[in-house]
Amino acid sequence: ELCDDDPPEIPHATFKAMAYKEGTMLNCECKRGFRRIKSGSLYMLCTGNSSHSSWDNQCQCTSSATRNTTKQVTPQPEEQKERKTTEMQSPMQPVDQASLPGHCREPPPWENEATERIYHFVVGQMVYYQCVQGYRALHRGPAESVCKMTHGKTRWTQPQLICTGEMETSQFPGEEKPQASPEGRPESETSCLVTTTDFQIQTEMAATMETSIFTTEYQ
């Protein structure tokens, strides 16, 4: 089941997934001046079985100026995945975050792709938040968001993170990015009663800190 919305945005913070659940789609977007090749894939899809997941399809971009449909060939994601592990001769990577069962790792880049990737996430996907450089974290809970299905509708949990300027004093030190876990923390899904939600808490805290909210623009 696809998530209806994008993960929430937090001022002065950025998020990303450490691994992508099977069923996730990534649009094949090209940067300005380039377009998808004719007959090229519209998206990449994370697929797999119980033991192995990978991205199906490959994205290819070509210059908008030329009518030439010569393919700018990039290897299939699986080829690149293997090449990565053989080329790296040092023990730089511990367990690959995306070796989680039922998950794909970050798709490989392709020539002339758009700067920002547009993902279509599925229920159960988790994304992790960090404050951008120059800001520090004030935490009241996990700095992550999970796409959940509640009563037939999807929603993202609200990450408990506020990012404040480096110079401002803080009693909460910033935290390192957590190791990726495939599922979110347990939450009661049985009741639909609305009391003080995590969103309300976050909003109340944020109101005193920062009034502007970033919005993502996709071009």
Epitope: P7, E9, A13, T14, F15, K16, M18, K31, T74, K84, M92, Q93, P94, V95, Q97, R105, E106, P108, P109, W110, E111, N112, E113, A114, T115, E116, R117, Q130, C131, V132, Q133, G174, E176, K177, F214, T216
Partner: nanobody
């Protein structure tokens, strides 16, 4: 095919300088943080520096601040690490690495960790003698 090729390593005396280069192919820097890790014999790798392809934000670990400078030539798809006032403790294999930016094309320095990189080069050895 995505490739990262480092060059510029070598033997230098303490106090000397080196300039490392990382030439990339198969992708453009726009959506990535590109930079350097180093690994000394018997030690854990550490993230030295990065620069974001989207807006050129730079990061350095404390031990190299004021001595190392990272820069990029996006047109040439090359990232440079100018290393001045080198010390024996800078001796290590230096690896070029790449990590995808987060939402809004932004990046967090705590993500610059060895276990989370998308691609690596093969490394170039820097030896600083006393």
């Amino acid at each position: 095919e995505v490739q990262l090729v480092e060059s510029g390593g070598g033997l230098v005396q303490a106090g000397g300088s080196l300039r490392l280069s990382c030439a990339a192919s198969g992708f453009t820097f726009d959506g990535y943080a590109v930079g350097w890790f180093r690994q000394a014999p018997g030690k854990e790798p550490e993230g030295v520096s990065y620069i974001t392809g989207s807006d050129g934000v730079t990061y350095y670990i404390d031990s190299v601040k004021g001595r190392f400078t990272i820069s990029s030539d996006n047109a040439k798809r090359t990232v440079y690490l100018q290393m001045n006032t080198l010390k024996p403790e800078d001796t290590a294999v230096y690896y070029c690495a790449v990590d995808r930016l987060g939402s809004q094309g932004r990046y967090a320095s705590s993500w610059w960790r060895a276990g989370d990189m998308d691609f690596w080069g093969k490394g170039t050895l820097v030896t600083v003698s006393s």
